[in-house]
């Protein structure tokens, strides 16, 4: 969030000093809250970082994230027979990504037009709420998925209705929790008119009172509760999973599973390194610097980190690919522009041909042949 200096502060500041607080006087006259923006803040708002780099990244996220997560949700809801807990968590992950990504055209337009928000206060609040909501939803559902993957390896029992119901219950609890923790983002006024630039910003300029105290406390709480703790659980689950996979006996099938598990771990690790860790770290550092020094020296890094956090919507489909067989099939066929039905017919005909050949070879030979499809 950008902010500007007041005359007494030294150096380039990104603090939004409020020079008059919004309140209703005894006579019922509303006095406007004023947000300070200085030359440096103005140059960030008009610079290439916010008007070129951000829209490019958001366009990539939208173009990749919308169809891949859309397809994933469709596969998990309508093309997956058994609704395993993993499928339930991935469906929720895909839904969270879609709810965030669908607003990206507005976000892209906002940045391209010089950070000028023309779509009203309510839409700005929705966009910001969904933006942060998606990040924290992704972290929590990824944690559930990671713990569940470990649980499957440790306790490889069949699919039960009870497990699926527990997963649905946990998912609903996560949605409720995220809705509650993002309430402040919906309540706070996010759009501010900057006369000098003739633009209305969305979330990029906030009042100092709100920013210094509340924003630091808010994002620190989220970083600890909804990032660090789930990150610890995710890491623990994968460390234990690696140990289990190392010690288990290796046949061709389990080797494939092991490779997929490693790919999944690498993908989740990449997501944490690119999306979640930098954004959560810089959210806290940025607001801490403003709180303690009156200015943030990491504003550009903070902007980039928040932007990169949206890449989780592009990385999540790789998670689905390594976990879900159904999604893997549909993804491969979508990329090859083939229908699943056609592929299945091809597989059936190939399988029957193979069986007829094999039956003749079995009769002529005394050696047993192990086959796996």
């Amino acid at each position: 969030t950008i902010q500007g200096t007041n005359r007494s502060s030294k150096g380039r500041s990104l603090i939004g000093k409020v020079d008059g607080t919004s309140h209703v006087t005894g006579k019922g006259v509303t006095v406007e809250t004023v947000f300070s923006v200085d030359e440096f803040s103005a140059s960030v708002l008009t610079g290439k970082l916010t008007t070129v780099f951000l829209p490019i990244v958001y366009t990539i996220v939208f173009v990749v994230g919308l169809p891949s997560n859309g397809m994933a949700l469709w596969v998990f809801l309508f093309r997956t027979k058994k609704k395993h807990p993993a499928v339930i968590y991935m469906a929720n992950l895909a839904l969270a990504d879609l709810l965030s990504v669908i607003w990206f055209p507005l976000k892209i337009a906002y940045h391209i037009h010089g950070n000028n928000w023309i779509y009203g206060e309510a839409l700005c609040n929705v966009l910001i709420g969904f933006f942060y909501g998606n990040m924290y939803c992704s972290i929590l559902f990824m944690t559930c998925l990671s713990v569940q993957r470990y649980w499957v390896i440790v306790n490889p029992m069949g699919h039960s209705r009870k497990k699926a119901n527990i997963a649905i219950g946990i998912s609903l609890a996560i949605w409720l929790l995220i809705l509650l923790v993002t309430i402040p983002l919906y309540v706070v006024k996010q759009t501010i008119f900057i006369p000098a630039l003739n633009i209305t910003t969305c979330h990029d300029v906030l009042p100092e009172q709100l920013l210094v105290g509340d924003m630091f406390n808010y994002f620190l709480s989220l970083a600890i509760g909804v990032f660090l703790f789930p990150a610890f659980l995710t890491a623990s689950a994968y460390v234990l999973m690696i140990r289990m996979l190392r010690s288990s006996a290796m046949d061709e099938n389990s080797e494939k599973k092991r490779k997929r598990a490693i790919k999944l771990i690498v993908t989740v690790l990449a997501m944490y390194l690119i999306c979640f860790t930098p954004s959560n770290l810089l959210l806290v550092v940025h607001y801490f610097l403003i709180k303690s020094q009156g200015q943030s020296h990491v504003y550009a890094l903070y902007i980039v980190a928040l932007c990169l956090s949206t890449l989780n919507s592009c990385i999540d489909p790789f998670v689905y690919y390594f976990v879900s067989h159904d999604f893997r099939d549909h993804a491969k066929n979508a990329l090859l522009c083939r229908s699943v039905r056609t592929v299945k017919q091809m597989q059936v005909s190939l399988t029957s041909k193979k069986h007829s050949r094999k039956s003749s070879s079995y009769s002529s030979s005394s050696t047993t042949v192990k086959t796996s499809y």
């Epitope: 500007g4 005359r7 000093k17 020079d19 008059g20 406007e32 004023v34 947000f35 300070s36 923006v37 200085d38 030359e39 440096f40 803040s41 103005a42 140059s43 008009t46 610079g47 010089g114 501010i192 008119f193 900057i194 006369p195 000098a196 630039l197 003739n198 300029v205």
Partner: antibody, heavy 121, light 107 residues
Framework: EVQLVESGGGLVQPGRSLKLSCVAS????????MTWIRQAPGKGLEWIAS????????FYPDSVKGRFTISRDDAKSTLYLQMNSLRSEDTATYYC??????????????WGQGVMVTVSS | DIQMTQSPHSLSASLGEGVSIECLAS??????LAWFQQKPGKSPQLLIY???SLQDGVPSRFSGSGSGTQYSLKISNMQPEDEGVYYC?????????FGGGTKLELK
């Protein structure tokens, strides 16, 4: 001490062009927005152009849009105003001013001595 | 464009007297108003910004007030050096516009 010194004014025929310059000193030029404001003889003040500290954005009123161009050279701490298709109503004293952004708005806190531009045949 | 109307057009005041100049905007300008003083043959000088904030180096006898569309500049103790033309200017919406000016003379 902040100083703004304009030059390049004079008598010019209608339809012709003229380029005004303003050399700034006493402050970090590339940190500040700059503005041109004019004052017709015996008349009030009229804002005519502004440029951001990065030079990334420029602003003009409709009366000069498409005819006047504001630019800056940070290396030389110089502000320019290129005036094309001049009209008799452009006759005025042109002031180079430093604009400071405070509370989201731009305020003209330092002014040059002004340079006279006369458009006449 | 936002029209800025100043009143009175001119006024004269005695030494030590209090003076008030009014500025009316054609629409609300959210306190984004500046006041300038221009002495004869000189460049204008910023006195007040954001309706009521005193610019550095400006004597405290100058004060600004107002909100919405109505603003005023007050000089509490008229001095000889206060003679000149006073302009209000809105910085809320492009194009930035000035009032027609108020000429202040010493009686």
């Amino acid at each position: 001490e902040v100083q703004l010194v304009e030059s390049g004014g004079g008598l010019v025929q209608p339809g012709r062009s003229l380029k005004l310059s303003c050399v700034a000193s006493g402050f970090t030029f590339n940190n500040k927005w700059m503005t041109w404001i004019r004052q017709a003889p015996g008349k009030g003040l009229e804002w005519i152009a502004s440029i951001t500290n990065t030079g990334g954005r420029t602003f003009y009123p409709d009366s000069v849009k498409g005819r006047f161009t504001i630019s800056r050279d940070d290396a030389k701490s110089t502000l320019y105003l290129q005036m094309n298709s001049l009209r008799s109503e452009d006759t005025a004293t042109y002031y180079c001013t430093r604009a400071t952004i405070r509370r989201g708005a731009s305020y003209f806190d330092y002014w040059g001595q002004g340079v006279m531009v006369t458009v006449s045949s | 464009d936002i029209q800025m109307t100043q009143s009175p057009h001119s006024l004269s005041a005695s030494l030590g007297e209090g003076v008030s100049i009014e500025c009316l905007a054609s629409e609300g300008i959210s306190n984004y108003l500046a006041w300038f003083q221009q002495k004869p043959g000189k460049s204008p000088q910023l006195l007040i910004y954001y309706a009521s904030s005193l610019q550095d180096g400006v004597p405290s006898r100058f004060s600004g007030s107002g909100s919405g569309t109505q603003y005023s500049l007050k000089i509490s103790n008229m001095q000889p050096e206060d003679e000149g033309v006073y302009y209000c200017q809105q910085g809320y919406k492009y194009p930035w516009t000035f009032g027609g000016g108020t000429k202040l003379e010493l009686k």
